[in-house]
Amino acid sequence: QDSRGCARWCPQDSSCVNATACRCNPGFSSFSEIITTPMETCDDINECATLSKVSCGKFSDCWNTEGSYDCVCSPGYEPVSGAKTFKNESENTCQDVDECQQNPRLCKSYGTCVNTLGSYTCQCLPGFKLKPEDPKLCTDVNECTSGQNPCHSSTHCLNNVGSYQCRCRPGWQPIPGSPNGPNNTVCEDVDECSSGQHQCDSSTVCFNTVGSYSCRCRPGWKPRHGIPNNQKDTVCEDMTFSTWTPPPGVHSQTLSRFFDKVQDLGRDYKPGLANNTIQSILQALDELLEAPGDLETLPRLQQHCVASHLLDGLEDVLRGLSKNLSNGLLNFSYPAGTELSLEVQKQVDRSVTLRQNQAVMQLDWNQAQKSGDPGPSVVGLVSIPGMGKLLAEAPLVLEPEKQMLLHETHQGLLQDGSPILLSDVISAFLSNNDTQNLSSPVTFTFSHRSVIPRQKVLCVFWEHGQNGCGHWATTGCSTIGTRDTSTICRCTHLSSFAVLMAHYDVQEEDPVLTVIT
């Protein structure tokens, strides 16, 4: 007990009434109004509790404190009086704060601030939406990926900040009357090939594709080394030149010079130059054969190989080049006697006759074109008298049956060996290179030097042999009739042809030599 009459054991937040009793301080309460034992406690009264008599008024919040309370304006409101806290509704001067006026950048870009009681909202501009994680921030709506599919399928959607565009895809253009950009844009494929908007090299043909185009090598051309075919940047070279080189293993200055000219022509070649290029090649060949130079010093076998290589390559080159000629008949002749006759036509149903100084060729147009080949039909005949120099002493290989027949009617091959070339060597070719088995035969009429009496005249072709060289052969060719200076031959394939006089001694009149013409 306190001598002054005040209890010393009063619990926290209470004061003594007398020596034996205590009372809770204002703002605190205990189980009974007067505390008589130290076991009792004083607890804070929450004046802000719902059942409390305290009323702070509108736009305000009650904040409980230890032993008391404060009234404060709610967020978004402020007291007109300037007093931060107050105790009851009569002291309440809270009014709405206009955050939009206070801070014009509140909604950042692309949004308009709208004041609300106690707060504000951001109203996004068209093409923007509130960010879910930050409802005060307007972010661009990507109309292209939002699943709205705002554009026509012929266009592609381009998202812009706050908007979008429907643009024609590359290689497409707006249909007549359509804009290019708004959501009502409708497009159609541009035919770059026919409109001339392509950038195909002249060595290629333009092919339109949906929304684009490609450049394919012309027939008889191939992509330059390392460049793929069928691309926009494809550049091609004429196959007919790129691989016509001297035969590996044959070394001749004259031949090298000829092939250097051929390669130069190939490098500068454009389809429009086909006519000139053909003439230049034949001119070069004519000059080569007129003055063979060191070719004549090569061993005979090598000379035959060179002739074989020249005949083979010439046929390929002329076939390739003639596909780029316009329809009609061409005739060229050169000083040393080389002659070319060429007819180019769209497929026609008739026979064709090509006439030259020393040879005439007759065949059916239908042979000329391979089925499914879109190009023009070409029939060509080249007379190459100069080739005879290189083919001197070339062997003749007869089929066993013909060999036997000759042995029956002739005494056999005389000792002086190789047959004599009576005619010019001619080479026949078609746009169709599959000419090993013609559906109807080709007829050749050769003019040639006189036949020595009692000698066998044979229609022959040059067979490119196993060793890349070759020999004369008669397979598939028959002699229809012969006179002193002309012979008619009929063959079931195309190649290079000639009339030979074989050194057989005719024992009796040979019915084969009877003139049928």
Epitope: M239, T243, W244, T245, P246, P247, P248, G249, V250, H251, S256, L301, Q302, C305, D312, D316, H464, G465, Q466, N467, G468, C469
Partner: antibody, heavy 120, light 107 residues
């Protein structure tokens, strides 16, 4: 016995030069055309050059034309391949080979090869 | 350039089998094609020249055929020592070009 022995290979920087040699024995060297053929690290074979028996004709693919020079010394029975402006794609094992008589132009004898590496 | 294509990069066979390796030229090369065998760690060696001529000392189980654009090398009665890479080569025109090679594996 026909024998071809290459030498002169090694490591060289891009743009650098190297001279390969091929010593021949056991045959009439001056009667045969000869070639260099290389084998890339991926095992592809590539023809590099050919020289005629007398040495007055040489042939090259576009990939080496103007950079490589093939020559021969028939008195010494030796071939030379002078390589300049070397590129990484020239990295290979280089073989010299003898050609059979034309028109059978097969390469009937090959050396063991010399390795060339072009790298920085 | 004439492209020589060996479409089979690898071929697997057993001793005693017959196998055909093919080579296709991008254009007519007549018969100017050779076949070469390269055993591991060795230089190439000619087997066949001019498409079908077996070279001296080459066993007769190796046969070459073809002309124009399609060529084949046939190995009948394959032996374990035939494990090698096989290359075709054309010498019809310059540049001389090889096929990419076919690796023969023996099971």
């Amino acid at each position: 016995e026909v024998k071809l022995v290459e030498s002169g290979g090694g490591l060289v920087k891009p743009g650098g030069s190297l001279k390969l040699s091929c010593a021949a024995s056991g045959f009439a060297f001056s009667s045969y055309d000869m070639s260099w053929v290389r084998q890339t690290p991926e095992k592809r074979l590539e023809w590099v050059a050919t020289i005629s028996s007398g040495g007055n004709y040489t042939y090259y693919p576009d990939s080496v034309k103007g950079r490589f020079t093939f020559s021969r010394d028939n008195a010494r029975n030796t071939l030379y391949l002078q390589m300049s402006s070397l590129r990484s794609e020239d990295t290979a094992l280089y073989y010299c080979a003898r050609h059979y008589d034309y028109p059978d132009y097969a390469m009937d004898y090959w050396g063991q090869g010399t390795s060339v590496t072009v790298s920085s | 350039d004439i492209v020589m294509t060996q479409s089979q990069k690898f071929m697997s066979t057993s001793v005693g089998d017959r196998i055909i390796i093919t080579c296709k030229a991008s254009q007519n090369v007549r018969t100017t094609v050779d076949w070469y065998q390269q055993k591991p760690g060795q230089s190439p060696k000619v087997l066949i020249s001019l498409a079908s001529n077996r070279h001296t000392g080459v066993p007769d189980r190796f046969t070459g055929s073809g002309s124009g654009t399609d060529f084949t090398l046939t190995i009948s009665n394959v032996q374990s020592e035939d494990l090698a890479d096989y290359f075709c080569l054309q010498h019809r025109n310059y540049p001389l070009t090889f096929g990419g090679g076919t690796k023969l594996e023996i099971k």
